[in-house]
Interface confidence: medium
């Protein structure tokens, strides 16, 4: 069965900058990637970047930086100022649309205890929705 | 809940222009769908594709508007508009503004899975 992780990581340099990690654990081939934050896209979730493997990527504030890693996973860079900027409990959501399988989503945020500049390593969060 | 709010419509001659805006707002988030689009409906006649742009800019048209209408979307303020040039009496009809998300970022043929709409301005040409 196909999974999504997604790793948050607050930044020891800047401590109002988020970086946010995804990968898709399946077969497919990936078509779209959208990452929220606040929930879903669309289900009280504010997006943030859309990736597309051929078309390009879209990004809105206070998104600085959205790229993908590797055929199956992206990062994306928060800088965080003024009303926009995200918190420590802010839940971050990535959803891959793949082909054959559908899509998959996810979520996660800052692990609790976390110290700036370190991060829980990428596990599979709980897959929210398969469309 | 999502909401769609068209503006911009009225009474224009044949051969004339208007432009409509849509303005896509939601309560305590900022919805970005992926495919925005313009759909219409004539008196006595079926609900009509008439235009759609997606997130990454892609459009599609209507063979019946292609070189007289133009769409486009600003993602920063999550309007979409439609400007209509040459506009005939047979563009009168009342026009929609869709919105909703699909697998690909692409607009779906036919609107499928464009789940939030406005509620329509009216467009009438007429001398």
């Known amino acids: 069965t196909p999974e999504v992780w997604v790793q948050v990581r607050m930044e020891a340099t800047e401590l109002s900058s988020f970086t946010i990690r995804c990968g898709f654990l399946g077969s497919g081939s990936i078509s779209l990637v959208t990452v929220s934050w606040g929930g879903p896209n669309g289900a009280g979730g504010t997006t943030l970047a859309v990736l597309h493997p051929e078309r390009g990527i879209r990004q809105w504030a206070p998104a600085r930086q959205a790229r993908w890693e590797t055929q199956s996973s992206i990062s994306l860079i928060l800088e965080g100022s003024g009303a926009s900027s995200p918190c420590a409990n802010t839940t971050f959501c990535c959803k891959f649309a793949s082909f054959p399988e559908g899509s998959w989503e996810a979520c996660g945020s800052l692990p609790p205890s976390s110290d700036p500049g370190l991060s829980a390593p990428p596990t599979p969060a709980p897959i929210l929705r398969a469309d | 809940e999502v909401q769609l709010v068209e503006s911009g419509g009225g009474l224009v001659q044949p051969g004339g222009s208007l432009r409509l805006s849509c303005v896509a707002s939601?309560?305590?988030?900022?919805?970005?769908?992926?495919?925005m689009a313009w759909f219409r409906q004539a008196p006595g006649k079926g609900l009509e594709a008439v235009a759609g742009?997606?997130?990454?800019?892609?459009?599609t048209y209507a063979d019946s508007v292609k070189g007289r209408f133009t769409i486009s979307r600003d993602n920063a303020k999550n309007s979409l508009y439609l400007q209509m040039n040459s506009l005939r009496a047979e563009d009168t009809a009342v026009y929609y503004c869709?919105?909703?998300?699909?697998?690909?970022?692409?607009?779906?043929?036919?609107?499928?899975?464009?789940?939030?709409w406005g509620q329509g301005t009216m467009v009438t040409v007429s001398s």
């Open positions: 939601a309560s305590g988030f900022t919805y970005r769908p992926y495919c």
């Open positions: 869709a919105a909703g998300d699909s697998p690909d970022g692409r607009c779906p043929p036919l609107g499928q899975g464009l789940n939030y």
């Open positions: 742009i997606d997130i990454f800019g892609g459009t």
